[in-house]
Interface confidence: low
């Protein structure tokens, strides 16, 4: 009497999450009777997975009628295949006893599971940094399957290489999850600029995912100050301009101070926008002369994102000079900076 | 909940043609193989005629080239055409399905009366 | 063709008796038998199958035994409920074929 084969003719199949997968077995006989079962690993811990015979198997359904007594085809389909669902599968032949007695097992077929990678999560620093610091951007991505992915990360299109990616876990698993780190160096323009993670996978046919991050989440440029002085007028009034620009975020406040006392406080908004994405903003002080005895010590403060305060200060002498002042620019653009403004009254 | 209900029978002339119909609602008819089993008056249980989930059909001999059995996926429903009725044909006729695992049947419809006589 | 063939054809008994039917195949079907349970004026009802098999909601009263050509059906315990016709079935290979049933009575 010929011995009982049975065929498991593939050694692995690979099918997309979400697909059904189809996992072949034939025997060479029916006799002896007993019945096919399938099960997912090898030993005692082996998992039942479908019984042609009896049971309750939902997401199992037989290939061929395996009610049909001259059928040798035990073919299984499983629909809906999770991750969860990869591992080794064997079908086996049993002879009908009590308990059911193991006659002849399959080779197996690996049944490995494609599943997609979730949309990439791009995440920047929790606190805004200047130009010419170096910020870290982080890119994740989970759920996939087989393991073999590429991150890329790009900057304004031009691909970044100060990454550094890891995929978990390091062993075997039924999926996996990517996480990278991008350094990104600021520039003022970076304004309007973007940070891509984009994530190839066997299951994309081609079309990476993306996930991205706008710089001006993470960037501040510190403003530029400049203080001008206009010529006096012929009513012994000087106007002083304060001009704050190349500034991002919006978020602004400028405070003139008289002598160390405030004079007036004012807030940024509704700035139009620089192509840069930067703002600018210009604030005038009117300093009557002829009302001082003394010298007048004008200070223009500007706190910006919560920052230190940023001040240019000048003095105005009151004394005997020319009534017209040509045009005095305080050129600095942090710390102190003090300009004499001479004002005559006669 | 699973349901097979028969209808189409009545009384027929020998010779005469009949066409049963079985809905089946709770199952997908065309995963399982499917039977018509019938019962004369006062006899016992006889099996009639089979198809299986590919199509593949089978008939007792006395049936043979007389009955046809085919179903219509879309409607969920079986059928058996019954030409050049005889009187030995006069039964209850019960649409049957055949379990998943071997074929063994496990629901029956109600039955429908079917009478040849002149 | 198989045929079945079912013994006896009529059996008296009492409520909360123990019964036993039979069935024998002309030739080998493995474990290919099933039992039905039929009432006047009703469809049958499956009760078992693959020789010792209940289908869902049968009453665990019944059981099968047997393989090859010979098998039987048990009801341990009968109840007024339980009298009715009984028929086994082979379903090896077509043509399936059915034993000349069994009438269960009221003694």
């Known amino acids: 009497e010929e011995e009982l084969q049975v065929i498991q003719p593939e050694k692995s199949v690979s099918v997309a999450a979400g697909d059904s997968a189809t996992l072949n077995c034939t025997v060479s006989s029916l006799i002896p009777v007993g019945p096919i079962q399938w099960f997912r690993g090898a030993g005692p811990g082996r998992e039942l997975i479908y019984n042609l015979k009896e049971g309750h198997f939902p997401r199992v359904t037989a290939v061929s009628d395996p009610t049909k007594r001259n059928n040798m085809d035990f073919s299984i389909r499983i629909s809906n295949i999770t991750p969860a669902d990869a591992g080794t599968y064997y079908c086996v032949k049993f002879r009908k006893g009590s308990p059911d007695v193991e006659l002849k097992s399959g080779a197996g077929t690996e049944l490995s599971v494609r599943a997609k990678p979730s949309a990439p999560v791009v995440s920047g620093p929790a606190v805004r940094a200047t130009a010419e610091h170096t910020v870290s951007f982080t890119c994740e991505s989970h759920g996939f399957s087989p393991r073999d992915i590429t991150l890329k990360w790009f900057k304004n299109g031009n691909e970044l290489s100060d990454v550094q990616t890891n995929v978990d876990p390091a062993g075997k698993s039924v999926s996996y999850s990517i996480r990278s780190t991008a350094r990104v160096l600021l520039t003022r323009r970076d304004v309007h600029s973007q940070v891509i993670c984009e994530v190839a996978h066997v299951t994309l046919q081609g079309d990476p995912l993306r996930g991205t991050a706008n710089l001006s989440e993470a960037i501040r440029v510190p403003p530029f100050l400049e203080v001008t002085q206009q010529s006096m007028r012929a009513d012994n009034q000087v106007n002083v301009t304060c001009q704050v620009t190349k500034f991002y975020p919006q978020r602004l406040q400028l405070t003139w101070l008289e002598n160390g006392n405030v004079s007036r406080t004012e807030m940024a908004s509704a700035l139009p926008e620089n192509k840069d994405g930067t703002y600018n903003w210009t604030s005038w002080l009117l300093v009557n002369v002829s009302a001082h005895r003394d010298d007048v010590k004008l200070t223009c403060q500007v706190e910006h994102d919560g920052q230190p305060a940023v001040n240019k200060s000048f003095s105005v002498k009151v004394s005997a000079h020319p009534k017209e002042q040509g045009s005095n620019t305080a050129a600095e653009n942090t710390g102190t900076n003090e300009r004499n403004i001479y004002g005559g009254s006669g | 909940e699973v349901q097979l209900v028969e209808s189409g029978g009545g009384l027929v002339q020998p010779g005469g043609s009949l066409r049963l119909s079985c809905a089946a609602s709770g199952f997908t008819l065309s995963s399982y193989d499917m039977h018509w089993v019938r019962q004369a008056p006062g006899k016992g249980l006889e099996w009639v005629s089979a198809?299986?989930?590919?199509?593949?059909?089978y008939y007792t001999g006395s049936v043979k080239g007389r009955f046809t059995i085919s179903r219509e996926n879309a409607k969920n429903s079986l059928y058996l055409q019954m030409n050049s009725l005889r009187a030995e044909d006069t039964a209850v006729y019960y649409c049957v399905r055949g379990g998943v695992w071997d074929d063994a049947f496990d629901i029956w419809g109600q039955g429908t009366m079917v009478t040849v006589s002149s | 063709d198989i045929q079945m063939t079912q013994s006896p054809s009529s059996l008296s008994a009492s409520v909360g008796d123990r019964v036993t039917i039979t069935c024998r195949a002309s030739q080998g079907i493995n474990n290919y038998a099933a039992w039905f349970q039929q009432k006047p004026g009703k469809a049958p009802k499956s009760l078992i199958y693959t020789a010792s098999s209940l289908h869902s909601g049968v009453p665990s009263k019944f059981s099968g035994s047997g393989s090859g050509t010979d098998f039987t059906l048990t009801i341990s315990s009968l109840q007024p409920e339980d009298f009715a016709t009984y028929y086994c079935?082979?379903?090896?290979?077509?043509?399936?074929?059915f034993g000349q049933g069994t009438k269960l009575e009221i003694k």
């Open positions: 079935q082979q379903y090896v290979s077509y043509p399936y074929t």
């Open positions: 198809i299986g989930t590919a199509g593949d059909t």
